[in-house]
Interface confidence: low
C-alpha cells in the first residue's frame, strides 16, 4: 500500500470486479498504522486517525487491529488485500460494511481484528455483540 500521507488520484488501470461483475475502484480507509489508543472496555470506538488514504489496489479493504498487553493498548489502521493473511490471520469479514472486531488467539496479549468494505469503515471499530453482521436489520440500514 502507498504511504498514508500521500494523497493519490486513482490512476492504475487494474479493474477488479466483485461476484456480480460490478467494478470495484480503490477504497478509502483510515491509515495511521500503529498508534497508542485509549479504547478499552467500550462497545465501539473511533480510531482517532486523521489520515484517510486511497488504497493502492482496488481489491484492498480496510483493516483495524486492536491489541492490549500489560503495558499499553494500540490500534492499527491500514489497507490490506483480503486474499493475503494479515498478522497471520485471514480477513474473513472483508465484505462487511462495518468493522466488527473479533478476538484472535495471540500469546501474551489480547488481540482483536476486523476488516470491512465501505469508505473509512475502520474509523469506527465495534466490539459489541449486538452489532453482528448476520443481523438483517444492520444490513438493511447499510444497503438500502
Amino acid at each position: 500500500t502507498i504511504p498514508p500521507h500521500v494523497q493519490k488520484s486513482v490512476n492504475n488501470d487494474m479493474i477488479v470486479t466483485d461476484n456480480n461483475g460490478a467494478v470495484k475502484f480503490p477504497q478509502l480507509c483510515k491509515f495511521c498504522d500503529v498508534r497508542f489508543s485509549t479504547c478499552d472496555n467500550q462497545k465501539s470506538c473511533m480510531s482517532n486517525c486523521s489520515i484517510t488514504s486511497i488504497c493502492e489496489k482496488p481489491q484492498e479493504v480496510c483493516v483495524a487491529v486492536w491489541r492490549k498487553n500489560d503495558e499499553n493498548i494500540t490500534l492499527e489502521t491500514v489497507c490490506h488485500d483480503p486474499k493475503l493473511p494479515y498478522h497471520d490471520f485471514i480477513l474473513e469479514d472483508a465484505a462487511s460494511p462495518k468493522c466488527i472486531m473479533k478476538e484472535k488467539k495471540k500469546p501474551g496479549e489480547t488481540f482483536f481484528m476486523c476488516s470491512c468494505s465501505s469508505d473509512e469503515c475502520n474509523d469506527n471499530i465495534i466490539f459489541s455483540e449486538e452489532y453482528n453482521t448476520s443481523n438483517p436489520d444492520l444490513l438493511l440500514v447499510i444497503f438500502q
Partner: antibody, heavy 122, light 107 residues
Framework: EVQLVESGGGLVQPGGSLRLSCAAS????????MTWVRQAPGKGLEWVSV????????YYADSVKGRFTISRDNSKNTLYLQMNSLRAEDTAVYYC???????????????WGQGTLVTVSS | DIQMTQSPSSLSASVGDRVTITCRAS??????LNWYQQKPGKAPKLLIY???SLQSGVPSRFSGSGSGTDFTLTISSLQPEDFATYYC?????????FGQGTKVEIK
C-alpha cells in the same frame, strides 16, 4: 427511499457569502462520500467539491479553491457548502449528490438533489 | 485536468431509432467513465458507471462501452422519455470532469 434536499440558495452581491445545506435521508449518511456539482444557466455540469464519509478527505475544483468550504454534520445527516467571495461566474444551480459505493472518491454519483439556485449579481 | 469531449453536441432522432453518443478523453482513463441523463429543470440521473455497468433501475436499452480514451453510450431503441441531454464524466482523477453534453431532440 434516498432523498437529498438542498436549501440556502438565493440572490447575493459579488463578494458576498452564502451557505448551502443538503439534508439527506433514507441511507446511512456517514459511510457515503458526498459531492457538490453546479450547472450555470444553459450550460453543462461542473464538479465543485467532494467530502468523504467522516470528512477526513476533501477535494475542490480549482475554480472554487480558497473560496468555498465543504463540510458535513453526520449527526444531523447534513452536507454544507460555505461559499465566500462570490463572483458572477458562480451563478448556477447547485446540486448535492451522493457518491455511489464504487470505491472511488471522485466516482459516479448515484443520487442527486433537486438543486438550489445561487445568483450572484449586483 | 482531463478534458472530455462529446460528439455530437446535439442530434435529432425518432422514436425507435438506435442512437449512439461518443465521448473522448484527453488521456487514458481506463474504464473510469460514467454517463448521466438530464431532463430540463431536473437533476442528472446516473445511467452507466465504470464505462459499461448499468445502474440499478435503468432500462436495458441503455448500454455503454469503451476503455482508454474512447467511449460510447448507445440507446438501442429510442423511447419518448429518452429525449434529454446526456453527459459523460471521467472519474479517473481529480477533478472528475464532465463532457459538454449531447442534446437528443425529437426529429
Amino acid at each position: 427511499e434516498v432523498q437529498l434536499v438542498e436549501s440556502g440558495g438565493g440572490l447575493v452581491q459579488p463578494g458576498g457569502s452564502l451557505r448551502l445545506s443538503c439534508a439527506a435521508s433514507g441511507f446511512a449518511f456517514d459511510i457515503y462520500a458526498m459531492t457538490w456539482v453546479r450547472q450555470a444557466p444553459g450550460k453543462g455540469l461542473e464538479w465543485v467539491s467532494v467530502i468523504s464519509g467522516s470528512g477526513g478527505t476533501i477535494y475542490y475544483a480549482d475554480s472554487v479553491k480558497g473560496r468555498f468550504t465543504i463540510s458535513r454534520d453526520n449527526s444531523k445527516n447534513t452536507l454544507y457548502l460555505q461559499m465566500n467571495s462570490l463572483r458572477a461566474e458562480d451563478t448556477a444551480v447547485y446540486y448535492c449528490a451522493r457518491r455511489g459505493q464504487y470505491r472511488d472518491i471522485v466516482g459516479a454519483t448515484d443520487y442527486w438533489g433537486q438543486g438550489t439556485l445561487v445568483t450572484v449579481s449586483s | 485536468d482531463i478534458q472530455m469531449t462529446q460528439s455530437p453536441s446535439s442530434l435529432s432522432a425518432s422514436v425507435g431509432d438506435r442512437v449512439t453518443i461518443t465521448c473522448r478523453a484527453s488521456q487514458s482513463i481506463s474504464s473510469y467513465l460514467n454517463w448521466y441523463q438530464q431532463k430540463p429543470g431536473k437533476a442528472p440521473k446516473l445511467l452507466i458507471y465504470a464505462a459499461s455497468s448499468l445502474q440499478s433501475g435503468v432500462p436495458s436499452r441503455f448500454s455503454g462501452s469503451g476503455s482508454g480514451t474512447d467511449f460510447t453510450l448507445t440507446i438501442s431503441s429510442l423511447q419518448p422519455e429518452d429525449f434529454a441531454t446526456y453527459y459523460c464524466q471521467q472519474s479517473y482523477s481529480t477533478p472528475p470532469t464532465f463532457g459538454q453534453g449531447t442534446k437528443v431532440e425529437i426529429k
